[in-house]
């Protein structure tokens, strides 16, 4: 494949990554699948710089990111190490709260209205952000 050199239409470039901000809501798994179909992934936040950029563009709205603990430990969807990486949880979070009455705990992370993170029920229909790296090879076949 060829290396992507600029962001697709309606995506926003920042620090060699491209971001797409949804305007509707989906469950975490549906949002995750949407990004994958776009040859991207749910946003992986690795620094304050990236946090601030995403936080401004989503506004004060609950928004899914690419972080979950559905299989036990917290994991970023692109394999970025969670334990040593950037974190911006709200106080007392994540708490895997079971009191919501929807069954199970809370396994998916989202940005809250002030930008800090919370874990919530993965079925909630929140907005989401896709991210893809500009330097990664696209899946399109090369032009002959």
């Amino acid at each position: 494949g060829s290396e992507r050199t600029c962001c697709p239409v309606n995506w926003v470039e920042h620090e060699r990554s491209c971001y797409w901000f949804s305007r509707s809501g989906k469950a975490w798994a549906d949002a995750d699948n949407y990004c994958r179909l776009e040859d991207a992934h749910l946003v992986v936040v690795t620094s304050w710089e990236e946090q601030k950029f995403v936080q401004h563009h989503i506004g004060p709205v609950n928004t899914w990111m690419g972080l979950h603990d559905q299989n036990g430990p917290w994991k970023w969807v692109d394999g970025t190490d969670y334990e040593t990486g950037f974190k911006n949880w709200r106080p007392e979070q994540p708490d895997d709260w079971y009191g919501h009455g929807l069954g199970g705990g809370e396994d998916c992370a989202h940005f809250t209205d002030d930008g800090r993170w919370n874990d919530d029920v993965c079925q909630r229909p929140y907005r989401w952000v896709c991210e893809t790296e500009l330097d990664k090879a696209s899946q399109e076949p090369p032009l002959l």
Epitope: N10, E13, H56
Partner: antibody, heavy 118, light 105 residues
Framework: QITLKESGPTLVKPTQTLTLTCTFS??????????VGWIRQPPGKALEWLAL???????RYSPSLKSRLTITKDTSKNQVVLTMTNMDPVDTATYYC??????????WGQGTLVTVSS | SYELTQPPSVSVSPGQTASITCSGD??????VCWYQQKPGQSPVLVIY???KRPSGIPERFSGSNSGNTATLTISGTQAMDEADYYC????????FGGGTKLTVL
Amino acid sequence: QITLKESGPTLVKPTQTLTLTCTFSGFSLTTGGVGVGWIRQPPGKALEWLALIYWNDDERYSPSLKSRLTITKDTSKNQVVLTMTNMDPVDTATYYCAHIIAVAFQHWGQGTLVTVSS
Amino acid sequence: SYELTQPPSVSVSPGQTASITCSGDKLGHKFVCWYQQKPGQSPVLVIYQDRKRPSGIPERFSGSNSGNTATLTISGTQAMDEADYYCQAWDSSTVFGGGTKLTVL
């Protein structure tokens, strides 16, 4: 080259509605990450942010003025319109529109002075 | 509502370093921009995303942002740098500081 120009009345009466138009060139308001914002500056005072609109129709307003403001865009005309209701003499200011990219007001118009007086 | 505080005035001798501060609660968690405004002119962006310089802005302008304070630093200050400077914080919305008048003595 990016340019922006504000237009509208220079004098409005108290309680009237102000309508300002920002006409721009050199960028498209359909490009991801791009927006246009409005800022005002009373004579001899500080800048005050009013409102902004992004490529994806996301609108943001100053909390203290939100009930009085409406921002709209017309991408075919390369224009952004700000309306402000119930004008008062304290709203007398130079009103600027500005081009937003990379989370910053990167380019500004020349500004238009609006006086509110009976 | 969120507020940014700047000193009303800062004085500096030509060739010296001027530092203008901007303070706000957890300001380091937000992007900060700095604008220069000369009398009768529109503001000009000099720093964005805390520390980036737009093309055409001299290297003597630099920015930093951590904790509760952002700082605009002008090294080797020149007479032409005399102006009002405004900080601006971006969160879900945005807000300006009250401005600082920089005087080059």
